[in-house]
């Protein structure tokens, strides 16, 4: 019978035991930076080439006995998970292994850096097809390791890493915290986050998605036909490296940004029990479990978007938080969130030739998050239109006035500390969906984009009585690009996108009381691209 | 301790070179920074990654490394260049005393220096 983890990542229509995914990653080379491996294991024999690269520290302690099978255990298992004949994800992928971890599973940042440099030089000397680099290791936050990962990613390499097994914020570890790397947390057969001894999988905004990482059967270095169960975020990352190899084999021209968006899009949504995570991390942690796409082609027509959370701003009055999209992505909207509700909104601004999303803390606030909605929109031309605070009681409004530009997101930013406390709600005039509306004391920012075939519409869901959460979702075939609240009253903690749903959070109802201020409206901007759909049909 | 001493026996004492006197000050207004692992048991003091500014060529990296060795030697310190980086990041990996960090941070082209640290199988 098919092991649980392979069943979990396989789309339902392919769940037959004999399912052999097309290509199986045969056009892709996967580099593994790990322990030594047993390359003659029947699972991986002929699939893994052991390079002559080795950079490892001495083993600790006088009692340590170097036992070949123990030295090879981690790397052999992961190679099997990626490309093993019986228990592998991408059975056609070829692999190359670099030894950067010793027999105790320990390495150094410098050894890992030299390994990444080795891969880059190999790529330059002998360019092959798409490259995936699997980094099933973690250390403390390292600026230099993150920088090296960024450079390699910008050279067209897909890096996949373990989130870490420390039951902690993945942003405190490297390479997990590198934005260019695909960072993977671990879940079990019950779609619960994995517990390992007293610890478990890492979590937080630096995790891109989760994948099976507990009780994973794979090649054992005890003998050439042995199997063993291993667990950890390394195993989870190996699943995603295998899925990435499959996707790249089917579509070799995919960029890192496109691959990441597809991994997110095809993941199982909202299946993880978030109660396992610390309360303050739940909103930041993606509720996504990786899966193979249902078919190798036909995803190109989709408008893909993802949500990127910033680091926390910190509590000082003028503190700000910035969320950025990847170089190939467009920032289509910007929102903010504060647990205390004390914030001064958010704005989209240019930084280094690219738009970023900046959120502003307010006096007495515990800090804010900026939330960017980052999308793949080829040939897009986006700009931000700003209306300064209006004097009129009707409030501030701004629209997309350029021909062919559509509204993809609304942001508002204010200087006063208690905007909306004594103000009546501002209502959007009907029949004017292509504009952003806000308080008269607020600056309003409209994200306006022109792209072939791009069309957008506004969808609202209002609740008259106060509720902790109001949501509005885009329907099938449409993608959420913008998420904001109307009106920006003081009890609104903020707005953010979760998959295709706009979530507006308010203060605990018991503390708010039901007043005229209680009305909360979630505003979603839903877009689609007819151009992408036509291009996809022409390809088929 | 014995291991460490053994390692240092291999280190080449860098002789004072002519170019040592040419040490130019780092570009005005930019100060190189030092970073180390926040988790103390994972730190590996004595080994440092010296990262140079983005457009630095390999020859400049080698020259900066030699300059560090020469300036350290003048102060009576042994250093060993373990690796010169190029291809991803310009810079070098050096085994040296932490006493030399202040000196190393003032070298031309230096962007930042990071103390080496451990990584672990997950």
């Amino acid at each position: 019978s098919i092991p649980w983890n392979l069943e979990r990542i396989t789309p339902p229509r392919y769940r037959a035991d004999e399912y052999q995914p097309p290509d199986g990653g045969s056009l892709v080379e996967v580099y593994l930076l790990d322990t030594s491996i047993q390359s003659d294991h029947r699972e991986i024999e002929g699939r893994v080439m052991v390079t002559d690269f080795e950079n490892v520290p001495e083993e600790d302690g006088t009692r340590f006995h170097r036992q070949a099978s123990k030295c090879d255990s981690h790397g052999t298992h992961l190679a099997g998970v990626v490309s093993g004949r019986d228990a592998g994800v991408a059975k056609g992928a070829s692999m190359r292994s670099l030894r950067v971890l010793n027999c105790q599973g320990k390495g150094t940042v410098s050894g890992t850096l030299i390994g990444l440099e080795f891969i880059r030089k190999s790529q330059l000397v002998q360019p092959v097809g798409p490259l995936v680099v699997l980094l099933p290791l973690a250390g403390g936050y390292s600026r230099v390791l993150n920088a090296a990962c960024q450079r390699l990613a910008r050279a067209g390499v897909v890096l996949v890493t373990a989130a870490g097994n420390f039951r902690d914020d993945a942003c405190l570890y490297s390479p997990a915290s590198a934005p260019e790397v695909i960072t993977v947390g671990a879940t079990n057969a019950q779609d619960q986050p994995v517990t390992l001894g007293t610890l478990g999988t890492n979590f937080g905004r630096c995790v891109d998605l989760f994948a099976p990482g507990e009780d994973i059967i794979g090649a054992s270095s005890d003998c050439s036909t042995c199997f063993v169960s291993q667990s950890g975020t390394s195993q989870a990352a190996a699943h995603v490296a295998g899925i990435a190899a499959m996707m790249l084999s089917a579509e070799p021209e995919l960029t890192l940004a496109e691959l990441r968006q597809r991994l997110i899009h095809f993941s199982a949504k909202d299946v993880i029990n978030e109660a396992w995570f610390p309360e303050d991390q739940r909103v930041l942690t993606p509720n996504l479990v990786a899966a193979l796409p249902p078919s190798t082609h036909g995803a190109g027509w989709q408008l893909f978007c993802r949500t990127v959370w910033s680091a926390h701003s910190g509590p000082t009055r003028m503190a700000t938080a910035v969320a950025r999209c990847a170089p190939d992505e467009e920032l289509l909207s910007c929102s903010s969130f504060s647990r205390s509700g004390k914030r001064r909104g958010e704005r989209m601004e240019a930084q280094g030739g690219k738009l970023v999303c900046r959120a502003h803390n307010a006096f007495g606030g515990e800090g804010v998050y900026a939330i960017a909605r980052c999308c793949l929109l080829p040939q897009a031309n986006c700009s931000v239109h700003t209306a300064p605070p209006a004097e009129a009681s009707m409030g501030t409004r701004v629209h997309c006035h350029q021909q062919g530009h559509v509204l993809t997101g609304c942001s508002s930013h204010w200087e006063v500390e208690d905007l909306g406390t004594h103000k009546p709600p501002v209502l959007r005039p009907r029949g004017q969906p292509n504009q952003c509306v806000g308080h008269r004391e607020a600056s309003i920012h409209a994200s306006c984009c022109h792209a072939p075939g791009l069309e957008c519409k506004v969808k609202e869901h209002g609740i008259p009585a106060p509720q902790e959460q109001v949501t509005v979702a885009c329907e099938e075939g449409w993608t959420l690009t913008g998420c904001s609240a109307l009106p920006g009253t003081s009890h609104v903690l903020g707005a953010y996108a979760v998959d295709n749903t706009c979530v507006v959070r308010s203060r605990d109802v018991s503390t708010t009381g039901s007043t005229s201020e209680g009305a909360v409206t979630a505003v979603a901007i839903c877009c689609r691209s007819r151009h992408l759909a036509q291009a996809s049909q022409e390809l088929q | 301790q014995e291991d460490e001493d053994g390692d240092y026996e291999e280190l080449v004492l860098a002789l004072r070179s002519e170019e040592d006197g040419l040490a130019e000050a780092p570009e005005h207004g930019t100060t190189a920074t030092f970073h180390r692992c926040a988790k103390d048991p994972w730190r590996l003091p004595g080994t440092y990654v010296v990262v140079l500014k983005e457009e630095t060529h390999l020859s400049q990296s080698e020259r900066t490394a030699r300059r560090l060795q020469a300036q350290a030697a003048r102060r009576g310190y042994l250093t060993k260049i373990l690796h010169v980086f190029h291809g991803l990041l310009p810079g070098f990996l050096v085994k040296m005393s932490g006493d030399l960090l202040e000196l190393a941070l003032k070298l031309p082209h230096v962007d930042y220096i990071e103390e080496d640290s451990s990584v672990f199988a997950q």
């Epitope: 599973g105 | 199988a121 997950q122």
Partner: antibody
Framework: EVQLVESGGGLVQPGGSLRLSCAAS????????MSWVRQAPGKGLEWVAN????????YYVDSVKGRFTISRDIAKNSLYLQMNSLRAEDTAVYYC???????????????????????WGQGTTVTVSS | DIQMTQSPSTLSASVGDRVTITCRAS??????LAWYQQKPGKAPKLLIY???SLESGVPSRFSGSGSGTEFTLTISSLQPDDFATYYC?????????FGQGTKLEIK
């Protein structure tokens, strides 16, 4: 679905020998430790022995040490219990069971996390009597 | 060797009752304890592992707690299918031991 089927039980005289077999399906057999557990008539469960995936480690309850030998054949997906010098108190239903557990790295060491015996055979009866 | 002592040996209860079975270890076993259910003529079935983790497919009315030397198995609302014998098992080392069992019968 993993299945375990025991065989080889029967009636044997004190001092005699028997070899029990347990046939398993799928690669999952070779991925876990395996145990033999017995249950004397009307009594509770007693763990007898277990064996590592590759057969390199074996453990026994004190009462059978030196008399029983656990082994496995990965190629045949089979587990065995060779029982020698049998005694009347060895009379029981013998179950083979999968010891589900997993290895993981933490603090520079390879740790074992045990879940318990999650798959059991239907049992084979061994009667030691003259 | 570590000894496991279960109490009570027999427990009479009715459908809908909340029942608790206790297991004591002769020395600390951390959380390395499993609970099994066995019906007459059948093989045992794993219910709980690592003292409190529910095995896949086991109803949520079963729960486990404890660490060190004192452990409990709780059935929140007895169902007709739950009348059986329950065993605890320690696995602090690679050698295991079971408790003597608790027979849960209909009152």
């Amino acid at each position: 679905e993993v299945q375990l089927v025991e065989s080889g039980g029967g009636l044997v005289q004190p001092g005699g020998s028997l070899r029990l077999s347990c046939a398993a399906s799928g690669i999952t057999f070779s991925s876990y430790w395996m145990s033999w557990v017995r249950q004397a008539p009307g009594k509770g469960l007693e763990w007898v022995a277990n064996i590592k995936q590759d057969g390199s480690e074996k453990y026994y309850v004190d009462s059978v040490k030196g008399r029983f030998t656990i082994s496995r054949d990965i190629a045949k997906n089979s587990l065995y219990l060779q029982m020698n010098s049998l005694r009347a108190e060895d009379t029981a239903v013998y179950y083979c069971a999968r010891d589900r557990g997993t290895y993981y790295y933490a603090d520079g060491d390879y740790n074992y996390y045990y879940y318990g015996m999650d798959v059991w055979g239907q049992g084979t009866t061994v009667t030691v009597s003259s | 060797d570590i000894q496991m002592t279960q109490s009570p040996s027999t427990l009479s209860a009715s459908v809908g009752d909340r029942v608790t079975i206790t297991c004591r270890a002769s020395q600390s076993i951390s959380s390395w304890l499993a609970w099994y259910q066995q019906k007459p003529g059948k093989a045992p079935k794993l219910l709980i592992y690592k003292a409190s983790s529910l095995e896949s497919g086991v109803p949520s009315r079963f729960s486990g707690s404890g660490s060190g030397t004192e452990f409990t198995l709780t059935i929140s609302s007895l169902q007709p299918d739950d009348f059986a014998t329950y065993y605890c098992q320690q696995y602090n080392s690679y050698s295991y031991t079971f408790g003597q069992g608790t027979k849960l019968e209909i009152k």
